[in-house]
């Protein structure tokens, strides 16, 4: 489950921040299990970017259709 | 939004206690909690962190035997279990989440260890 | 994380634009929080991400970033500002905070 905070109840995102997301601070680096951490501005969270194979909202689950997928390939 | 923490606790010499935060208007599983610690007079101190999503904890050095940081996704709740209490764990505590945006603190809890 | 708040305090003037600098050891890319505290109550958190005005704080206090050096600002003093500021770093664990700068009427 990849929930979000209510954006109705937060205060609109200050005008000088213009992009969409920002690194993660050092205290994330373990925040994704198999993926990069990101900083979502807008809904002030971090957030993880999968690599290939992995889902879940925190890159924590194998996928197990890219991994048929590959087995697939393969034959 | 906001973290609202448990009353003022006044407990013995040698016993534990558990204290807890309860967020409103936002998902305590999408992000760290944090706890600190400040004594009377005296500046802020980090306890610890909690990812309420697995439970993942991780201490500040000083409070690693002193300090359990647990968390119910079901009630929104962080908590921050003290144990072997002495005067030198009279002090208020606070729990936290920052974003670069927002940040939320609760409003304290007030722990005197007495005898 | 060092942070350094080089003043633990300020004798300053009602109305005065006041200056409060804390310098991080290494570089927190502005993950960077300014608190008020006044005897007694909770710290009261004034702005975070170095720039972030919290809602509901005066539009008086401003923060701003260059390099490794943080500065919070108060435009034009008020009685109700007099208070000891915190900065905090929130780039890496253990968070750490500055040691305080309390401001105090001339």
């Known amino acids: 489950e990849n929930s979000t905070s209510p954006l109705s109840a937060d205060p609109p995102v200050a005008a000088a921040v213009v992009s969409h997301f920002n690194d993660c601070p050092d205290s994330h680096t373990q925040f994704c299990f198999h993926g990069t951490c990101r900083f979502l501005v807008q809904e002030d969270k971090p957030a993880c970017v999968c690599a290939s194979g992995y889902v879940g909202a925190r890159c924590e689950h194998a996928d197990l259709l890219a991994v048929v997928a590959a087995s697939q390939k393969k034959q | 939004v906001q973290l609202q923490q448990s009353g003022a606790e006044l407990v013995r010499p040698g016993a534990s206690v558990k204290l807890s935060c309860t967020a409103s208007g936002f998902n305590i599983k999408d992000d760290y909690m944090h706890w600190m610690k400040q004594r009377p007079e005296q500046g802020l101190e980090w306890i610890g962190r909690i990812d309420p999503a697995n439970g993942n904890t991780k201490y500040a050095p000083k409070f690693q035997d002193k300090a359990t940081i647990t968390a119910d996704t079901s009630s929104n709740t962080a908590y921050l279990q003290l144990s072997s209490l002495t005067s030198e764990d009279t002090a208020v505590y606070y729990c936290?989440?920052?974003?670069?945006?927002?940040?939320?603190w609760g409003q304290g809890t007030t722990l005197t260890v007495s005898s | 994380i060092q942070m350094t708040q080089s003043s633990s305090s300020l004798s300053v003037s009602l109305g005065d634009r006041v200056t409060i600098t804390c310098k991080a050891s290494?570089?927190?890319?502005?993950?960077l929080a300014w608190y008020q505290q006044k005897p007694g109550n909770a710290p009261r958190l004034l702005i975070s991400?170095?720039?972030n005005l919290k809602t509901g704080v005066p539009s008086r206090f401003s923060g701003s970033a260059s390099g490794k050096d943080y500065t919070l600002s108060i435009t034009s003093l008020q009685t109700e500002d007099v208070a000891t500021y915190y900065c905090q770093q929130y780039w890496d664990t253990p968070w750490t905070f500055g040691g305080g700068t309390k401001l105090e009427i001339k």
């Open positions: 290494v570089h927190i890319n502005s993950w």
């Open positions: 936290s989440r920052m974003g670069l945006l927002r940040g939320y």
């Open positions: 991400g170095a720039t």
